[in-house]
Amino acid sequence: SGTTNTVAAYNLTWKSTNFKTILEWEPKPVNQVYTVQISTKSGDWKSKCFYTTDTECDLTDEIVKDVKQTYLARVFSYPAGNVESTGSAGEPLYENSPEFTPYLETNIGQPVIQKYEQGGTKLKVTVKDSFTLVRRNNTFLSLRDVFGKDLIYTLYYWKSSSSGKKTAKTNTNEFLIDVDKGENYCFSVQAVIPSRTVNRKSTDSPVECMGQEKGEFRE
């Protein structure tokens, strides 16, 4: 159904990292425009990206209102010169997205090692707490603020002179590990949300190695 020469959107896909959330779809419009609506299960649909020729719509502002809700978006197609025109059912053509629950599904961005400090046989590695676009009391929350103890970090570390990797885990943003005095180590970290069924792990952070030109203390 639908107005002649107007086609429904398809391949609706959520792209979301650290709660920055974009809905993408096809096709590139020919003589048509799109409007997006988003709603939680309440059915209170909110329109966004009015009459756009883009094939993406930033829905971050809506999903960050409650990242634990499940959202559905729908993309309406209208003839380019006549957005009042409707299909044979008296409604514009539209397609629904998959359901999306940000808390369970947003990709966790690549973590960054903020600093490392060695004191004798102890090495402290601190992971930078990435900020999100989720707000509370007018301030942006960090990943740790949002996920709390649901978020853990895994540290992979090894002696620069060998390839045998060891791992450590923390539910804070700091690791304190035992190392051999006088040895240089390399390490990277990965964010993990063990309770998830999808998108459980981030990509690994860039590898940092001690004893390089940046020195043993890096901020």
């Epitope: 159904s1 639908g2 299960k41 309440s42 649909w45 044979s88 059912a89 629904n96």
Partner: antibody, heavy 118, light 107 residues
Framework: EVQLLESGGGLVQPGGSLRLSCAAS????????MSWVRQAPGKGLEWVSS????????YYTDSVKGRFTISRDNSKNTLYLQMNSLRAEDTAVYYC???????????WGQGTLVTVSS | DIQMTQSPPSLSASAGDRVTITCRAS??????LAWYQQKPEKAPKSLIY???SLQSGVPSRFSGSGSGTDFTLTISSLQPEDFATYYC?????????FGQGTKLEIK
């Protein structure tokens, strides 16, 4: 566990009024659209009306527009259907149902019977 | 309004049988279709939404397929508790409409 309990049905004369209630529990009521569906004796299902979680959006089947009003009180976790100018053809079991996104009906009450007869 | 036509209106089958019920919409509804089961004197129960998504708690012997105008509900191996009436419902546009029902009876 989601529970929906309808009440307010009964026998009413043609032209009369009735108010159905549906008490909801086991979920965050305001987070869901809700609907009324009816079933005449020995017949199939007929969608009657839906309302969004905020109550800002309401929808009706043509045969009840102007006669029935759907509403909700989120502070009381209760859905209502005010039925005026009742007709014999409104005789049915009325079910309230939870309706994610105002679409399908994922949980149903046990129903309440409305009989319109003189 | 979108008309929903189910077939067959009634069906006799035995436990263990594979059963398919079809539902046709009078115009395209994409995948905006749900299936319900109703037993005598009981409220309907949700089985399938979005044409093929299984409602939580529903046995995996139930499955749905289709898009556009033609849809099917399949029960892979009938169990005694599956004898009931089945309804499809479109939620593409208001007013939402149901099929007339398919009564599944014991042969």
């Amino acid at each position: 566990e989601v529970q929906l309990l309808e009440s307010g049905g009964g026998l009413v004369q043609p032209g009369g009024s009735l108010r159905l209630s549906c008490a909801a529990s086991g979920f965050t009521f305001s987070n869901y659209a809700m609907s009324w569906v009816r079933q005449a004796p020995g017949k199939g299902l007929e969608w009657v009306s839906s309302i969004s979680g905020s109550g800002d959006y309401t929808y009706y089947t043509d045969s009840v527009k102007g006669r029935f009003t759907i509403s909700r009180d989120n502070s009381k976790n209760t859905l209502y259907l005010q039925m005026n100018s009742l007709r014999a053809e409104d005789t049915a079991v009325y079910y309230c149902a939870r309706s994610p996104w105002g679409y399908y009906l994922d949980s149903w009450g046990q129903g309440t019977l409305v009989t319109v007869s003189s | 309004d979108i008309q929903m036509t189910q077939s067959p209106p009634s069906l006799s089958a035995s436990a263990g049988d594979r059963v398919t019920i079809t539902c046709r919409a009078s115009q395209g509804i994409s995948s905006r279709l749900a299936w319900y089961q109703q037993k005598p004197e009981k409220a309907p129960k949700s089985l399938i939404y979005a044409a093929s998504s299984l409602q939580s708690g529903v046995p995996s012997r139930f499955s749905g397929s289709g898009s556009g105008t033609d849809f099917t509900l399949t029960i892979s191996s009938l169990q005694p508790e599956d004898f009931a009436t089945y309804y499809c419902q479109q939620y593409n546009s208001y007013p939402y409409t149901f099929g007339q029902g398919t009564k599944l009876e014991i042969k």
